[in-house]
């Protein structure tokens, strides 16, 4: 059986697959997924290994019409480095010489300058090029190689291994060499895989059942450390509770060097955030941190300094801490907008069972603002999801030059932010460089400000506008309001009407349904339309909603289904990657972010059309 990294190299024109008959004969044969000799896999960014021989595809020289055969894998050899060129060409790195079928006289696969159909290769059974099943480095744990990546294949006691092995062990622990010759270099580490006993790599907090892995012997960059955690279905450490910090202080007390945690300010337009999307509500900075030096965007925990945090350049090589298991956040159910009939007094705006109101003109210090909201039967607003934030920005009349109190503060416990309405902190969205909590002036209260409505801590004594929120009162059956310019069941935002398509559909079916409604799959022109759509679909139970974006027409170039330029994107992490497909908006913790899906997957969708009676603005000229 093929493992997920293995593939057959298929030429569509001949309908045959590459077959490693012997190390010196790499030919083609009728495709057979059970034949070891036809299985290949990437073993580095640029090397392809024959699974049968544990040798790599290579050439004797970078010249036209030489045979491609198998060689001992050597990551330094220029003659074994392959890259995908446009679409389905596979070429030797840095040259216009391609992996070619050969011809009637030449049965062997050849290196050839021609880029026709005989030089075009796909993964058998798919429409994808060979790079779509690319190599993912596997970072090791423990061992003696400072967390270096596995080198496949590697030699141990004169035998070659293309996967992690328990050779030499009686306990089943899986390991790999981190250079191709363990026998000479003696460098190895344990694999970040599940095997009997691998749970002893983790420390479980008996109070919360959350597990932590301290990799103090590793030396990785922040991004590599994060990848290593993710390979174990974990994330770099987030700390949201004081108890959690205390537990980790104990766990790391015997260590001296810094360890990467998930805190970072890598997002271009927002502030400090945890990589696992936990709220940044507890602060434990080392005095003098975070320093404002550019590039110091990643954070380490300092065992030698009472486990306090320090921001460093992300390329520094350190140990790291992974975290997995139940999140330390209290479970807090946010009702879906559609579940709650929301009735609000005049001048209050409804959303998901609550009513909201901006007080912009009567500026008040935080304490007085809170008193006013409570007198009105509510509280300073708490914000629990990106959808709720985006509702406030897109539908409450929030303005880019606003600076408004919200309910978040650390008045009760310094450096531990809480909502004034007592609801748990499940979400934060800080402005770049925030929370700064400047020591020379107490910044215990929080404002929303700037075009995105992101947050900053502020001295509580400033007179500012504020946002109140209260529970809505349910009264009788809900009246469906027909919005002016939109048909019944459609929701208006600015010049457009939007509708959720409730039948699970492929991208093509969704597009057709919208067209039948004299509409189209939604485009997203800017941050504000994105905010509206996030609040529109983000709290729904379904995972995805189709938008009109895809690269169906030209692979790698994403276009809307209608003739409109792509001027704004909101990709999820690791997107769009190399995957061709159609774009859907996520809901839940990644609410509103865009993922590339296979176009024949079924999802709900959002249709859009011009509202009636709206004058179309002129098309922007470039």
């Amino acid at each position: 059986l093929l493992d997920t990294r293995q593939f057959l190299i298929y030429n569509e024109d001949h309908k045959r697959c590459v077959d490693a008959v012997s190390p010196s004969a790499v030919q083609t044969a009728a495709c057979n997924q059970d034949a070891e000799s036809q299985k290949f896999r990437w073993v580095s960014e640029s090397q392809i290994m024959s699974v049968a021989f544990k040798l790599c595809l290579g050439v004797p020289s970078k010249t036209d019409w030489v045979a491609i055969t198998l060689y001992a894998c050597d990551s330094k050899s220029e003659f074994q480095k392959w890259e995908c060129k446009n679409d389905t060409l596979l070429g030797i790195k840095g040259e216009d010489l391609f992996f070619n079928y050969g011809n009637r006289q030449e049965k062997n696969i050849m290196l050839y300058k021609g880029s026709g159909l005989w030089s075009r290769w796909k993964i058998y059974g798919t429409t994808d090029n060979l790079c779509s099943r690319g190599y993912e480095a596997m970072y090791t744990l423990l061992g003696n190689a400072n967390g270096a990546t596995c080198a496949f294949p590697f030699k141990f006691e004169n035998k070659w291994y293309a996967d992690c092995t328990s050779a030499g062990r009686s306990d089943g622990w899986l390991w790999c060499g981190t250079t191709t010759d363990y026998d000479t270099d003696k460098l190895f580490g344990y694999c970040p895989l599940k095997f009997e006993g691998s749970e002893s790599l983790w420390n479980k907090d008996p109070l919360t059942s959350v597990s932590y892995q301290i990799n103090s012997k590793s030396a990785l960059t922040w991004h590599q450390a994060r990848k290593s955690c993710q390979q174990q279905n974990a994330e770099l450490l987030s700390i949201t509770e004081i108890h959690e910090q205390t537990y980790l202080t104990g766990l790391t007390s015997s260590l001296t060097s810094g360890l990467w945690i998930g805190l970072n300010s890598l997002s271009f337009n927002s502030g400090w955030q945890w990589s696992d999307r936990s709220p940044f509500r507890y602060l434990n900075w080392l005095p003098g941190s975070p320093s404002a030096e550019p590039g110091k965007s990643c954070v380490s925990l300092n065992p030698g300094k009472n486990a306090k945090w320090e921001n460093l350049e992300c390329v520094q090589k350190l140990g790291y801490i992974c975290k997995k298991g139940n999140t330390t956040l209290n479970s807090f159910v946010i009702p879906s907008e559609s579940d709650v009939p929301t009735h609000c007094p005049s001048q209050w705006w409804p959303y998901a069972g609550h009513c909201y109101k901006i007080h912009r003109d009567e500026k008040k210090i935080q304490r007085d603002a809170l008193t006013t909201c409570r007198k009105e039967g509510g509280d300073l607003t708490s914000i629990h999801t990106i959808e709720e934030l985006d509702f406030i920005i897109s539908q409450l009349g929030y303005e880019p030059n606003d600076e408004l109190w919200i309910g978040l503060n650390d008045i009760k416990i310094q450096m531990y932010f809480e909502w004034s309405d007592g609801t748990p902190v499940t979400f934060t969205k800080w402005l770049r460089g925030e929370p700064s909590h400047e020591n020379n002036r107490q910044e215990d209260c929080v404002v929303m400000k700037g075009k995105d409505g992101y947050w900053a801590d502020r001295g509580c004594e400033w007179p500012l506008g504020y946002i109140c929120k209260m529970k809505s009162r349910s009264q009788g059956p809900e009246i469906v309001e027909v919005e002016k310019g939109c048909r019944k069941g459609w929701k208006k935002h600015h010049f457009y009407c939007y509708m959720i398509g409730h039948t699970l559909s492929t991208f093509a079916e969704a597009n057709q349904t919208c067209n039948n409604e004299n509409a189209y799959l939604t485009t997203i022109e800017d941050r504000y339309e994105q905010a509206f759509l996030t609040s529109f679909v983000g709290l729904r139970p379904e995972k995805y909603f189709w938008t009109g974006l895809s690269d169906i027409q030209t692979k790698g170039t994403f276009q809307w289904t209608i003739e409109e330029e792509v001027r704004f994107t909101h990709w999820n992490s690791d997107m769009p990657g190399r995957k061709p497909g159609c774009v859907a908006m996520r809901t839940g913790i990644a609410g509103g972010l865009w993922d590339v899906l296979k176009c024949d997957e079924k999802a709900k969708f959002v249709c859009k059309h011009w509202a009636e009676g709206v004058t179309h603005p002129p098309k922007p000229t470039t």
């Epitope: 306990d171 190895f188 002893s200």
Partner: nanobody, 110 residues
Framework: QLVESGGSLRLSCAAS????????MGWYRQAPGKQREEVAA???????NYADSVKGRFTISRDNAKNTVYLQMNSLKPEDTAVYYC?????????????WGQGTLVTVSS
């Protein structure tokens, strides 16, 4: 070590060096002219296993904090005469897991 038949003896074995964790520890013995055989083993979780010939007479235990394993031998018989070896299955800075002690001779006289 010389002990009379019916007597008792306690063996101990400590693992040291750059050890991350010890997954199992055990005692083996080799009588003159015979194959080495497992006497008793204990996992990191404390599960134990005994050879039929010693069940009810020998007890294996371990002190995780000290990386030490013990073998309490009661009601000894002349056929228990052998060189006793301890083995630790460890996670350390080489990929090999099995580390052996140098062995101690136990002679049970009749």
């Amino acid at each position: 070590q010389l002990v009379e038949s019916g007597g008792s003896l306690r063996l101990s074995c400590a693992a040291s060096g750059s050890i991350f964790t010890i997954n199992a520890m055990g005692w083996y013995r080799q009588a003159p002219g015979k194959q080495r055989e497992e006497v008793a083993a204990i996992t990191s979780g404390g599960s134990t296993n005994y050879a039929d010939s010693v069940k009810g007479r020998f007890t294996i235990s371990r002190d995780n904090a000290k990386n030490t394993v013990y073998l309490q031998m009661n009601s000894l018989k002349p056929e228990d005469t052998a060189v006793y070896y301890c083995k630790a299955v460890v996670v350390t800075t080489t990929p090999y897991s099995d580390y052996w002690g140098q062995g101690t001779l136990v002679t049970v006289s009749s």
